[in-house]
């Protein structure tokens, strides 16, 4: 018995172009959450059922609003492990699948929406008791780095987790170095020694005296990172021109992609460009199958016709979406308008408004506005129920009446210094910074460091 | 008065697509759901699906589901079924149907149906 | 999703008749329910809202009534003008669902 535990470090926009839109906005807010479905990697063909060694769910992570205009970040995260607890032995080689879902927290008075965001698989070879491994994957636009291990439960141990030990009560009579062993007291066993200088965090053996490489790294001592560049000798000092004396192995070489995906090197891996119908960075994630069991909620899969529709989820009475992971009840199709509860009264549906809004679907927006003025030349706007001033150059507060300092916010950077103007601010810039804020570095060569058009 | 006035009858080939439109007059079309249903030649109704016209959130049944897209376009306050992939027991009487989006009222306005055929 | 079995399938009446035409729900559907009208080659129209409501326009001759999972459409005294199918329909969950329909034709 143990545990599998994923550690999720970052969920956000994959390199190269096409980056994603987030998948958040002021409209709809929205959190991540993640699933894992854990398979004993026997074969491709194997018939096990979906997740036989167990799935997850990850915590809901925290709220995320997009900044207009902004780039997909990073998206925060839950907190937390996702673990998976197996009865069993650890089968050493197994398959994972990754669900990054997005529950959507705007109008969905029906309850939220969920969404699938990516998906992504491997598999992986991983002795229990090893260091946390680390990993990239791709979705489409997307990339995900993790770390995972499997660890024993006490008094299991081993790199399957098989062998049963049990701490003595009375003083131990083996040997330095040696541990006593159920189900036999006396029998002593000796902790399994890899082969000498075997990388502790990059390397594992299953039998004594062998060093075995995770995932990304290589050599007889699994020191070797597999994107090192390809030159694994330099030249000799009487060599004039740089190069190398043998050329090593290339990150290509071999072709790491799978499925007839396209090898090429970057400077710090390789790339797959991988054929329609699969994904993933080595394209060994073809479109999710049945076998995966991407329906939620007992709804029934069936194959699809195409790689680009592996399956079809055929949902039960009250739920729908691709993975029947929405829940439809008669508020579902979000009759109360500016962030209005639904309520189901049995014979008819009512809204429940927020503050500033009125009518049988919220439909009203109460001008708080009237009878309200802004000082100082501050006009008032309308919006989500609230009064608010915007106020004129040199103005803040609720109404306009508060004189406002625009150094506060101490905005000259680089140790400019900020001076109160009747237009706004003036910033002067230390030596060597130029621009509004003294946001720009000025070169000795007397060009600045703005940035390309 | 409240009307719903459906675009006209179709003739189409296995494999092509159809639009059907549904113009909504005499009531705010925003305030009420809209329904499709079908009806095969000699049948009874079947529901296909249902669509909130101020926020375009759909709802299928579910043996409606891949080749039927709802729509509506607010600016002339029409809403559409769209199927793909034509077959032949598409052919059917397709009618648009409204609901107060309360759901105080059943569907009581009908469209005059279209009649789409599908034959090679 | 939710059976709604409409009987009779048909029927024959004559005019000034009283007509009853039940429809069960294989589950409670607390009155979320409705009766149509349809005559040949044309829509079909609203006669009954929550079980028991008349639409606007609809003669007096027609009514609703029941709870739970059964319904009844009853027209009073049949005339000329109201042979023609009728629907139950119900509208308490999603996928909404009709009755089989009656034909109601002349004796």
């Known amino acids: 018995a143990g545990v599998f535990e994923l550690q999720i470090h970052s969920f956000g926009p994959g390199p190269g172009p096409g980056a994603p839109r987030s998948p958040c906005s002021a409209r709809l807010p929205c959190r991540l959450f993640f699933r894992v479905c854990l398979k004993p990697g026997l074969s491709e063909e194997a018939a096990e059922s979906p997740c036989a060694l167990g799935a997850a769910l990850s915590a809901r992570g925290p709220v995320y609003t997009e900044q207009p205009g902004a780039p997909a970040p990073d998206l925060p995260l839950p907190d937390g492990l996702l673990q998976v607890p197996f009865r069993d032995a650890w089968p050493g080689t197994f398959s994972f699948i990754i669900e990054t879902w997005r529950e959507e927290l705007g109008d969905q008075i029906g309850g939220p929406a969920w969404s699938l965001l990516a998906r992504v698989a491997g598999r992986r070879r991983l002795a229990a008791g090893g260091p946390w491994a680390r990993d990239i994957q791709r979705a489409g636009a997307w990339e995900l780095r993790f770390s995972y291990r499997a660890r024993c439960e006490p008094p299991a141990v081993g790199t399957a987790c098989t062998r049963l030990c049990r701490p003595r009560s009375a003083p131990s009579r083996c040997g330095p170095g040696l541990r006593p062993c159920a189900p036999l007291e006396d029998e002593c066993e000796a902790p399994l020694v890899c082969r000498a200088g075997c990388s502790p965090e990059h390397g594992f053996c299953e039998q004594p005296g062998e060093c075995r490489c995770l995932e990304g790294w290589t050599g007889p001592l699994c020191t070797v990172p597999v994107s090192t560049s390809s030159c694994l000798s330099p030249r000799g000092p009487s060599s004039a021109t740089t190069g190398c004396l043998v050329p090593g192995p290339g990150p290509c070489d071999g072709n790491p992609c799978a499925n007839g995906g396209s090898c090429s090197e970057t400077p710090r891996s390789f790339e797959c460009t991988c054929p329609r119908g699969f994904y993933g960075l080595r394209c060994e994630v073809s479109g999710v199958t049945c076998a995966d069991g991407p329906c939620f909620n007992g709804g029934l899969c069936v194959g699809g016709a195409d790689p680009d529709s592996a399956y079809i989820c055929h949902c039960p009475p009250g739920f729908q979406g691709s993975n029947c992971e929405k829940r439809v009840d008669r508020c579902s199709l979000q009759p109360c308008r500016n962030g209005g509860l639904c309520l189901d009264l049995g014979h008819a549906l009512r809204c429940r408004c927020r503050a500033g809004f009125a009518g049988p679907r919220c439909e009203h927006d109460l001008d708080d506005c009237a009878g309200r003025a802004c000082a100082n030349g501050g006009t008032c706007v309308e919006g989500g129920g609230a009064h608010r001033c915007s106020c004129a150059l040199g103005f803040g507060g609720r109404d306009c009446r508060e004189r406002a300092d625009p150094c506060a916010a101490r905005p000259c950077a680089h140790g400019g210094r900020c001076y109160a103007h009747f237009s706004g601010l003036v910033c002067a810039c230390a030596p060597g910074y130029m621009g509004a804020r003294c946001e720009f570095p000025v070169h000795p060569d007397g060009a600045s460091a703005l940035p390309a058009a | 008065e409240v009307q719903l006035v459906q675009s006209g009858s179709e003739l189409k080939k296995p494999g092509a697509s159809v639009k059907v439109s549904c113009k909504a007059s005499g009531y705010t079309f925003t305030d009420y759901y809209m329904n499709w249903v079908k009806q095969a030649p000699g049948q009874g109704l079947e529901w296909m699906g249902i669509i909130n016209p101020y926020s375009g959130v759909t709802i299928y049944n579910h043996k409606f589901k891949g080749r039927f897209a709802l729509s509506v376009d607010k600016s002339s306050n029409t809403a559409y079924l769209q199927i793909s992939s034509l077959k032949a027991e598409d052919t059917a009487v397709y009618y648009c149907?409204?609901?107060?989006?309360?759901?105080?009222?059943?569907?009581?306005?009908w469209g005059q149906g279209t009649t789409v055929t599908v034959s090679s | 999703d939710i059976q709604m079995t409409q009987s009779p399938s048909s029927l024959s009446a004559s005019v000034g008749d009283r007509v009853t035409i039940t429809c069960h729900a294989s589950?409670?559907?607390?009155?979320?329910m409705g009766w149509l009208q349809q005559k040949p080659g044309k829509a079909p129209k609203g006669l009954i809202y929550?079980?028991?409501n008349l639409e606007d326009g609809v003669p007096s001759r027609f009514s609703g009534s029941g709870s739970g999972a059964d319904y009844t459409l009853t027209i009073s005294s049949l005339q000329p003008e109201d042979f023609a199918d009728y629907y139950c329909v119900q509208y308490a969950q999603f996928p909404y669902t009709f009755g089989g329909g009656t034909k109601v034709e002349i004796k």
């Open positions: 589950q409670g559907i607390s009155g979320n």
């Open positions: 929550h079980g028991a």
């Open positions: 149907a409204r609901q107060d989006s309360l759901l105080d009222y059943a569907m009581d306005y």
